[in-house]
């Protein structure tokens, strides 16, 4: 995140770091927990590492630097890369992780609402973007879970900003004009999150953007609303019966 | 299978005219960017031109700047390069390519994933 | 504009040898936006690597790229008689996009 600040503890209490074990480990990408087994994050962070056995999620943490050997982590069971999502192309950048065993909720490790299908209407004014990504371009994963306050643009807006690229209806671009806070390398995945009438609802997956934070060059994220049927479809035939954060 | 076919290229006279055309099959072409890429005999690779998924923006390497026109009719599945005030060292295989723009690492990529077999154009008198 | 240098101008090995191929850029690329292509006499270039280091589709894992900011390298682990090719690195970090002038990989 750049131009962020320090998140509290149970802020975000939605918020996972993706993590990777090879010969070291790492933090990859962030996610959102949406249900007691489920966590929504980008497709695109699973290219060229599909699979399962080398992901550790973390749940419930604030500061990457205090997880040990000894901290507990949730492990894979499943991963949903939409079917639709195509290395070549950066549409329906969206996968679903169902989790080996469920968690319990707690005050800091609890669900995101979600969106209603095709939510069109609804004009959110107060939306967030987390994560541990880099604080600046050529940077490095932060310890300490980042916020900032984002604007969403329109996608005509966005399209115009991005001319080489095409801007569907199923992504939701949020910046600020003059650029200096976005979401950035290691956020991908992550949650865009927006108030609500009292109620905080995941509007995007931190997707994709031009560089970190550049003037007129907006982040632009997979619109949940959009993937509400997928959501629903993938998480109750995998379930029977899926246990989800309602949309609200 | 995604498939480009060019076709349009021959023997011109130098400051002639010719138009090239790229018919692509087997993705969604209104989706991607697509390019031009010219190789003279017995050369290197030279990057000719680009046009955007929609067609509104295009972008020129300084050695056709002015000459060329590179466009697009995304209900036809069809690339153009209108090649004009031609030289004789715009005599080369003419390729267009398809632009992959995934995503990695919360950044955009841009890579050559097709190409068409290549049309040759000869500019001599 | 960003120059690609490539080295060396040739390659003689024999197959079964290891092929290190360099492209140097004379201003800094992101890694997503580099790529390496392979070209036989008569026919189209192929994509080989892209992102620097990820392979295409199809691409035997005897390939490999790697190199960031304006250090790139492909490596080909044990040449095939099918790998004796002219290979081009590319970046379109930034436009004009450009080509490296080329590495011929030939039989010694």
């Known amino acids: 995140i750049v131009g962020g600040t320090n998140s509290s503890w149970g802020e975000w209490p939605w918020q996972v770091s993706l993590q990777v074990k090879l010969t070291a480990q790492r933090h990859l990408c962030g996610g959102s927990l949406i249900g007691h087994q489920w966590v929504l994050t980008a497709a695109h962070c699973f290219d060229g590492l599909p699979l399962q056995d080398v992901w550790r999620i973390y749940s419930g943490i604030l500061n990457l630097s205090d997880i040990t050997k000894d901290t507990p982590f949730s492990q894979i069971k499943e991963i949903i890369i939409h079917q639709n999502y195509k290395v070549s192309e950066g549409n329906h950048d969206i996968a679903l992780i169902k989790l080996q065993a469920p968690l319990n909720y707690t005050e800091f490790q609890k669900p995101i609402c979600l969106p209603s299908k095709g939510d069109t209407s609804t004009i959110y004014t107060n939306c967030w973007v987390t994560g541990w990504g880099f604080s600046k371009e050529k940077g490095e994963i932060q310890n300490i879970l980042q916020k900032v306050n984002i604007p969403l643009v329109t996608n005509e807006e966005c399209q115009k900003r991005y001319q080489d690229y095409k801007i569907t209806q199923r992504m939701v671009c949020a910046g600020y004009k003059e650029g200096g806070k976005d979401a950035c390398k290691g956020d991908s995945g992550g949650p865009l999150v927006c108030k609500h009438n009292g109620m905080w609802r995941l509007v995007g997956i931190t997707s994709w953007g031009e560089g970190c934070a550049r003037r007129e060059q907006p982040g632009v994220y997979t619109k949940v609303a959009e993937y509400m049927d997928w959501i629903l479809e993938k998480t109750q035939s995998s379930d029977g019966k899926a246990q989800m954060q309602s949309p609200a | 299978e995604v498939q480009l076919l060019e076709s349009g290229g021959g023997l011109v006279q130098p400051g002639g005219s010719l138009r090239l055309s790229c018919a692509a099959s087997?993705?969604?072409?209104?989706?991607?960017?697509m390019t031009w890429v010219r190789q003279a005999p017995g050369k290197g690779l030279e990057w000719v031109s680009y046009i955007s998924p929609s067609g509104g923006h295009t972008i020129y390497a300084d050695s056709v700047k002015g000459r060329f026109t590179i466009s697009r009719d995304n209900s036809k599945n069809t690339l153009y390069l209108q090649m004009n005030s031609l030289r004789a060292e715009d005599t080369a295989v003419y390729y267009c390519?398809?632009?992959?723009?995934?995503?990695?690492?919360?950044?955009?990529?841009?890579?050559?994933?097709?190409w068409g077999q290549g049309t040759l154009v000869t500019v001599s008198s | 504009e960003i120059v690609l240098t490539q080295s060396p101008g040739t390659l003689s090995l024999s197959p079964g040898e290891r092929a290190t191929l360099s492209c140097r850029t004379s201003q800094f690329v992101n890694s997503n936006y580099l790529a390496w292509y392979q070209q036989k006499p008569g026919q189209a270039p192929r994509l080989l690597i892209y992102g620097a280091s990820s392979r295409a589709t199809g691409i035997p894992d005897r390939f490999s790229g790697s190199g960031s900011g304006t250090d790139f390298t492909l490596t080909i682990s044990r040449l095939e008689p099918e790998d004796f090719a002219v290979y081009y690195c590319q970046q379109s970090s930034r436009t004009p996009w450009t080509f490296g002038q080329g590495t011929k990989v030939e039989i010694k």
């Open positions: 390519a398809r632009v992959a723009r995934g995503i990695a690492a919360r950044s955009r990529t841009s890579y050559f994933d097709y």
């Open positions: 087997g993705f969604t072409f209104s989706h991607y960017l």
